[in-house]
Interface confidence: low
Amino acid sequence: FERTRSLQDPCSNCPAGTFCDNNRNQICSPCPPNSFSSAGGQRTCDICRQCKGVFRTRKECSSTSNAECDCTPGFHCLGAGCSMCEQDCKQGQELTKKGCKDCCFGTFNDQKRGICRPWTNCSLDGKSVLVNGTKERDVVCGPSPADLSPGASSVTPPAPAREPGHSPQ
């Protein structure tokens, strides 16, 4: 590796993947194993991120870029750069402090992450319920009762009773 030449800043010529080694007369030294520098002129190399435990390696560390992690199956990333992994739940559930819980009656979640959301209220748009909602799926709204041809009928919305075994959360 070349000795740096700039009079203003002797470290400015050190390329990415190296650091300006003050202990060796400001020579550009390669980053040690398991470290990197993503920009030129660095005085230190950063330790590579280690994807351990629930994290798994999506991109290996190189001398010029950090490792990138994602989450093992059954978990999903949260935060910039996948700084956390959160447990997946099944569709029709949401993650609470006590673990995965079924969506309350009248709500649904069609993903493995996130919270249960209320079914669409078709009547607010002057429409009727065409397909009932479930824990996993929102209701499907159909045309308004006035738009239906004579003799046609829509599905009546379910009575607001709780399904057995579904306690409020």
């Epitope: 400015s12 920009a39 002129g41 660095q42 950063d46 330790i47 991120r49 910039a80 750069g81 700084s83």
Partner: nanobody
Framework: EVQLLESGGGEVQPGGSLRLSCAAS????????MAWFRQAPGKEREFVSR????????DYVESVKGRFTISRDNAKNTLYLQMSSLRAEDTAVYYC???????????????????WGQGTLVTVKP
């Protein structure tokens, strides 16, 4: 003792400009990367921009690219954030932070930074 002190916040109309400053003391400012984060009421702290110790590389969150410019004056131990074309969604408390020498995290995550200022409030409203 490491200290970071932000200033320059205030109330401005949409489309206006502000320049935030972060004065550092108690450590070798020129040896560390620095960043700006912001936190709107009821929201998580969000990465805004980061500048390498020597100004050699910059990063911005997508929503501020072309509007905000990060810079530093190592002789004055000061970090700056020039903000223009401000929008209502830029309203937040803005914090400067010092990048750790070593971090296992992405540079946009707060865990990458070890010292933080107290923040300066930026309010954008008509």
């Amino acid at each position: 003792e490491v200290q970071l002190l932000e200033s320059g916040g205030g109330e401005v109309q949409p489309g206006g400009s502000l320049r935030l400053s972060c004065a550092a003391s108690g450590w070798a400012f020129g040896n560390y990367g620095m960043a700006w984060f912001r936190q709107a009421p009821g929201k998580e702290r969000e990465f805004v921009s980061r500048l390498a110790w020597n100004g050699g590389s910059t990063d911005y969150v997508e929503s501020v690219k072309g509007r905000f410019t990060i810079s530093r004056d190592n002789a004055k131990n000061t970090l700056y954030l020039q903000m223009s074309s401000l929008r209502a969604e830029d309203t937040a408390v803005y914090y400067c932070a010092r990048q750790r020498s070593y971090s296992r995290y992405d540079i946009r995550t707060p865990q990458t930074y070890d010292y933080w200022g107290q923040g300066t409030l930026v309010t954008v409203k008509p």
